[in-house]
Interface confidence: low
């Protein structure tokens, strides 16, 4: 297991498809590893775009060949399959497919696989074992849907060979390969502001930490060893270089901010919490 | 341990044909793309071959149409049938397992192909 | 195909020298360089993938640099088993292509 990854760990690729009329189309897909996004697609030159520097994995070079092949080919097939029967299927311009497809690990063993097919954000179809089956509340439109899909039984086969051989294959691969940049440990910025007043005689406390990962963090107001069940977490955002952000507020009545701290508890940290003083803060800001 | 051995050299005339093979053991034969490399006396490293863990099967462009590589996963194999060899031909070849991208991790020991009249 | 150009072609030094081998692509092959050992009578040996990764089982002395065209191999501190002959190997573009090599002899 990779430290800086939640188990279950998946690898999973994303195909949004953008249907905005009988001719005009876009896609966008991309592959993640667990939350962090490790691989996009280029669709002017049809080739998969490596973020990560390990992104590769241990395929080597022919069998990502082999890959784009297939997604560029799956890519064209999927676009006319769904013109061609969008009307029988009563999909309505504009309208959006998004299709997820990967595998999870769990305690280092391949767990299993999914592939899933939705419908305007709706859950419409789902690949099981070596075919497509409709998700029962979406209808007869997906199970004529699952029955044009499987028709090919074929192309059901490679889909099945991917989920179940080739994926696995590569998450395990991907994680010894990023071993060192997933295991890393960057320690947490911290500072305080003030956040916009909540009302008359009352204060926002932000407490901003930023720089960290891996991305699990625990972030509290205290006053002394009393954790402040008011603390707001906002979510935990992404930065550009690979580290996480996140900001926790607290409203306070503008005389009761004086014995509040912001803890900050991460493994980077070893037991050395980050500890700031909003007294410090205001006698400085 | 990864152990890759090499057989099938030997000493041809010009236009003659050889067939190789590497058995490979201590891994997962089948996870692995498959490579040919070879060494001419006294001379460089020069990419032969490869075979994909799918079966896609990539030459260099000086044996082309001449050399077919594949692999039988069930005997953890790799082959390469030479077909019209030439002089130049003449080299060590070493088969290697692909890892990192198209890095090399494991090669066998090699076996000699010698073409001449 | 991506040429592969190493300098010097050979190189004498001393035990306990520091080495330097530079490799040279004829475009940008970004990370994509992986270095090797060979001795005498011996298969290739992997020593630095991904320009400067390196492999599990060799000594820390050994380290890789560069990206894009220009990258280096070097050995921190020449040890007598260091003598042989080093290559470097693109990985970005199929046909894989390998550098002429550097025999490092002693001097």
């Known amino acids: 297991n990779a430290d800086g990854l939640k188990e279950p760990l998946s690898f999973h690729v994303t195909w949004i498809a953008s249907f905005y009329n009988h001719s005009w189309k876009q896609n966008l897909v991309s592959g993640w590893l667990s939350d962090l996004q490790t691989h996009t697609w280029d669709s002017n030159s049809s080739t998969i775009v490596f973020l990560c520097p390990w992104s590769r994995g241990n395929f080597s070079n022919e069998e990502w060949k082999e890959l784009e092949t297939l997604f560029r080919i799956r890519t064209i097939r999927s676009f006319e399959g769904i013109r061609r029967y969008a009307h029988e299927l009563q999909f309505e311009y504009p309208f959006e497919i998004q299709v997820t497809g990967g595998c999870e690990l769990h305690s280092g063993k391949v767990s299993g696989s999914f592939l899933q097919l939705a419908y305007q954000g709706s859950d419409f179809v789902s690949f099981q074992n070596n075919s497509w089956l409709p998700y029962p509340v979406a209808g007869n439109m997906a199970k004529h849907f699952c029955k044009v899909l499987n028709q090919n039984q074929h192309e059901n086969d490679i889909t099945h060979n991917l989920l179940s051989d080739t994926c696995p294959r590569f998450i395990l691969g991907l994680l010894d390969a990023g071993k060192a940049h997933l295991q890393r440990q960057v320690k947490p910025e911290a500072w305080l502001s003030h956040g916009p007043s909540p009302g008359p005689g009352h204060l926002q406390l932000v407490c901003h930490v930023s720089g960290f990962y891996p991305k699990p963090v625990w972030v509290m107001w205290m006053r002394g060893e009393q954790e402040q069940q008011g603390t707001q977490r906002g979510d935990i955002l992404p930065s550009a270089d690979g580290t996480w952000y996140l900001r926790a507020t607290l409203e306070v009545a503008a005389g009761e901010a004086a014995d509040l701290s912001c803890r900050v508890k991460h493994s980077s940290l070893e037991g050395q919490d980050i500890v700031l003083y909003w007294e410090h803060h205001s006698s400085v800001g | 341990e990864v152990q890759l051995v090499e057989s099938g050299g030997g000493l041809v005339h010009p236009g003659g044909s050889l067939r190789l093979s590497c058995a490979g053991s201590?891994?997962?034969?089948?996870?692995?793309?498959m490579h040919w490399v070879r060494q001419a006396p006294g001379k460089g490293l020069e990419w032969v071959s490869a075979?994909?863990?799918?079966?896609?099967?990539y030459y260099a462009d000086s044996v082309k149409g001449r050399f077919t590589i594949s692999r039988d996963n069930a005997k953890n194999s790799l082959y390469l049938q030479m077909n019209s060899l030439r002089a130049e031909d003449t080299a060590v070849y070493y088969c290697?397992?692909?890892?990192?991208?198209?890095?090399?991790?494991?090669w066998g020991q090699g076996t000699l192909v010698t073409v001449s009249s | 195909d991506i040429q592969m150009t190493q300098s010097p072609s050979s190189l004498s030094a001393s035990v306990g020298d520091r080495v330097t081998i530079t490799c040279r692509a004829s475009?940008?092959?970004?990370?994509?360089l992986n270095w090797y050992q060979q001795k005498p009578g011996k298969a290739p040996k992997l020593l630095i993938y991904?320009?400067?990764s390196l492999q599990s089982g060799v000594p820390s002395r050994f380290s890789g640099s560069g990206s894009g065209t220009d990258f280096t191999l070097t050995i921190s501190s020449l040890q007598p088993e260091d003598f042989a002959t080093y290559y470097c190997?693109?990985?970005?573009?199929?046909?894989?292509?390998f550098g002429q090599g550097t025999k490092v002899e002693i001097k």
């Open positions: 290697a397992r692909s890892a990192w991208w198209l890095s090399f991790d494991s």
């Open positions: 201590g891994f997962t034969f089948s996870s692995y793309a």
């Open positions: 075979i994909s863990t799918g079966g896609g099967t």
């Open positions: 475009q940008s092959i970004s990370s994509y």
């Open positions: 991904a320009a400067s």
């Open positions: 190997q693109q990985s970005y573009s199929t046909p894989p292509t």
